[in-house]
């Protein structure tokens, strides 16, 4: 049969509220060298126990009896501390455990989860969470909106999750947890009602350097909209903004619109350029969420200036004309150049030169036409840019370089057939 237990004092019981500090104590009397006392909780050795061991000899000799006291300190009682506690010693080849003591938790309900502050769009459903536990159980919850209970009694209304179908004004929510020991009230969560996201952002009109956009405002509850904010960002090719991407790749151009009307003219844009735009509307409570980025594009415009550095020289019945691309913005893709030349008493001759920046003209009448002048204009798909000032044909002087060019015969008739999609701004000398 087993040896008699060396334990002369067993752990007591502790029951209290969270945060309580308490001590469990066991005492044993042993002969010879005192053993190390281990503590068990629910059969598991406590490896990081806050325990102290005191050993008092009862005689002069080491082999006499010793009183050993082990104290386990529980510093701030938590649910994880609850259970059955025992002391454990190894004496010789035998194992002894004390009688158990129990640690229990009992007090006001303790919140595991409380409602959090949040923003919601007006008239939009959302959920709030609240969770509390004892012991003692059961714990019944009572939700309050703006300090008004949402049920007749605790446990009768929604419990862990409160579904709110929508709000039209900023409101406060809290929850009360009730058990046999009393009531605990959660923090008060403020639910701020923001305007709904605007809808149907669309283009009303387009100009090369401006876009007119409009949108439909969302509901904003009892709070009128104060303004809407529109952002435009260049669509960086290859880095295009995805429809729902939250942040643009660069600093956006931001404009504010007074409302109503829910419309805005965005100016100072680059022509023939892709942009992404989005809009958010603001009330006294704050801004709505942004709409998704909408891809838009400014149309092409005509070149804003004439070709530069035009030179025209004449050698007998031939004229050599060359120029450089306009310095002014092209406002689109350069499709080519138009050239017009005219003598003093002759009709104007119009030519489409294409993208070349020089041409050799074969003049009629063996160069006898006097006071010949040349004008050049650049064009895009949107039409012609302004014509250059008339440049007189200078007589060619020996020593001047004159490259060999394909000769362009003057058309037999002065009329010129324009491609149907070009708009020709007629030029008069």
């Amino acid at each position: 049969q087993a040896e008699e237990s060396p334990f002369v004092g067993n752990p007591g019981n502790i029951t209290g509220a969270r945060g309580l500090t308490g001590t469990l104590r066991c005492q044993l009397q042993v002969q010879g060298e005192p053993p190390e006392v281990h503590w068990l909780r629910d059969g598991q050795i406590l490896e990081l126990a806050d325990s102290t061991q005191t050993q008092v000899p009862l005689g002069e000799d080491e082999q006499d009896d010793w009183i050993v006291v082990s104290q386990l300190r529980i510093t701030s009682l938590q649910l994880s501390d609850t259970g059955q506690y025992q002391c454990l010693v190894f004496l010789g080849h035998q194992t002894f455990v004390s009688q158990p003591g129990y640690v229990g938790l009992e007090g006001l309900p303790y919140f595991l989860e409380e409602p959090e502050d949040r923003t919601v769009a007006a008239n939009t459903p959302f959920n709030l969470s609240c969770q509390a536990q004892g012991p003692p159980e059961p714990v019944d919850l009572l939700w309050l909106q703006d300090a008004v209970p949402l049920a007749t009694a605790p446990g009768h209304g929604p419990q862990r999750s409160l579904h709110v179908p929508g709000l039209n004004k900023t409101s406060s929510f809290s929850c009360e947890a009730h058990n046999a020991k009393g009531v605990t009230t959660s923090r008060t969560a403020t639910i701020t009602v923001l305007p709904q996201q605007p809808r149907n952002l669309h283009l009303v009109s387009r100009q090369p350097t401006e876009l007119e956009v409009a949108w439909t405002p969302g509901l904003s509850g009892i709070y009128p909209l104060t303004h809407c904010t529109l952002q435009a960002v260049l669509s960086d090719d290859g880095m295009g903004i995805q429809a729902g991407e939250p942040d643009p790749p660069e600093e956006p151009l931001t404009s504010q619109a007074s409302v109503p009307p829910h419309q805005l003219r965005l100016g100072s844009l680059h022509p023939h350029t892709p942009y992404h735009i989005r809009v958010a509307c603001t009330s006294s409570q704050g801004p709505s969420s942004w709409t998704h980025w909408l891809p838009v594009e400014t149309p092409e415009g005509v070149p804003l200036g004439p070709p530069e550095n035009i030179s025209a020289t004449r050698n007998g019945s031939q004229a050599f004309v060359h120029w450089q691309e306009p310095r002014a913005p092209l406002q689109g893709t350069l499709l080519g150049y138009r050239l017009a030349y005219q003598g003093q008493d002759t009709p104007e001759v119009l030519m489409d030169i294409g993208l070349r920046q020089e041409v050799t003209l074969e003049l009629q009448g063996d160069g006898s036409v006097s006071n010949l002048t040349v004008c050049v204009a650049a064009y895009t798909a949107a039409g012609d840019g302004p014509w250059s000032l008339p440049v007189p044909l200078e007589a060619w002087r020996p020593g001047q370089a004159q490259p060999v060019h394909q000769l362009v015969k003057e058309p037999s008739t002065p009329a010129f057939s324009w491609p149907h999609h070009h708009h020709h701004h007629h030029h008069h000398h």
Partner: antibody, heavy 116, light 106 residues
Framework: QVQLVQSGAEVKKPGASVKVSCKAS????????INWVKQAPGQGLEWIGW????????KYNEKFKGRVTLTVDTSISTAYMELSRLRSDDTAVYYC?????????WGQGTLVTVSS | EIVLTQSPDFQSVTPKEKVTITCSAS?????MYWYQQKPDQSPKLLIY???NLASGVPSRFSGSGSGTDYTLTINSLEAEDAATYYC?????????FGQGTKLEIK
């Protein structure tokens, strides 16, 4: 000396229940936890749960919760493990073991075979 | 749960050799326990609280380690040591065992 003696082998059909016993001697039965451990053929060891005979308190491995019930009869220093809704993968040797934060004494094991 | 991984799974050793079995825990633990199981027998406690020899266990067995890495050492192996060895933790619930190391004597 400490001894744990288990009941004999059992053959059961799928869906049935089995109850294995473990008789303790040589120590104060109500002071020490009794654990149950499963060992499937050619496999390792898997803890099922414990019971504290002094109070009847139990703790189960989540994997076995709902199908296993641990009980004791302190008057005859015997612990029991009942396993219900038996399946073919319940075929194993089941051990009872005394624990003091680890398993210091083991029963000889009971083979439970589940076969149709 | 804490997973214990033993190394090696199998070892064939000659008598008088020194054998080392390691056990690695998936997270830090305070104590390790070691068991020996011979064919058709129940497991037997060898080492408790990492380094303490259980009653009746020969002194050629020893245990050491801390944190996540623990070792069982058998100095001068004997024929009767042919068995499967298991490590075990109970630092957190549920208690778990290693997959076992089978030791064969050449």
């Amino acid at each position: 000396q400490v001894q744990l003696v288990q009941s004999g082998a059992e053959v059961k059909k799928p869906g049935a229940s089995v109850k294995v016993s473990c008789k303790a001697s040589g120590y104060p039965f109500t002071d020490f936890y009794i654990n149950w451990v499963k060992q499937a053929p050619g496999q390792g060891l898997e803890w099922i749960g414990w019971i504290y005979p002094g109070s009847g308190n139990t703790k189960y491995n989540e994997k076995f919760k709902g199908r296993v019930t641990l009980t004791v009869d302190t008057s005859i220093s015997t612990a029991y493990m009942e396993l219900s809704r038996l399946r073919s993968d319940d075929t194993a040797v089941y051990y009872c073991a005394r624990s003091t934060g680890f398993f210091d004494y083991w029963g000889q094991g009971t083979l439970v075979t589940v076969s149709s | 749960e804490i997973v214990l991984t033993q190394s090696p799974d199998f070892q064939s050793v000659t008598p008088k050799e020194k054998v080392t079995i390691t056990c690695s825990a998936s997270s830090s633990i305070g104590y390790m326990y070691w068991y020996q199981q011979k064919p058709d027998q129940s497991p037997k406690l060898l080492i408790y609280l990492t380094s303490n020899l259980a009653s009746g266990v020969p002194s050629r067995f020893s245990g050491s380690g801390s944190g996540t890495d623990y070792t069982l050492t058998i100095n001068s192996l004997e024929a009767e040591d042919a068995a499967t060895y298991y490590c075990q933790q109970w630092s957190s619930n549920p208690p778990t065992f290693g997959q076992g190391t089978k030791l064969e004597i050449k």
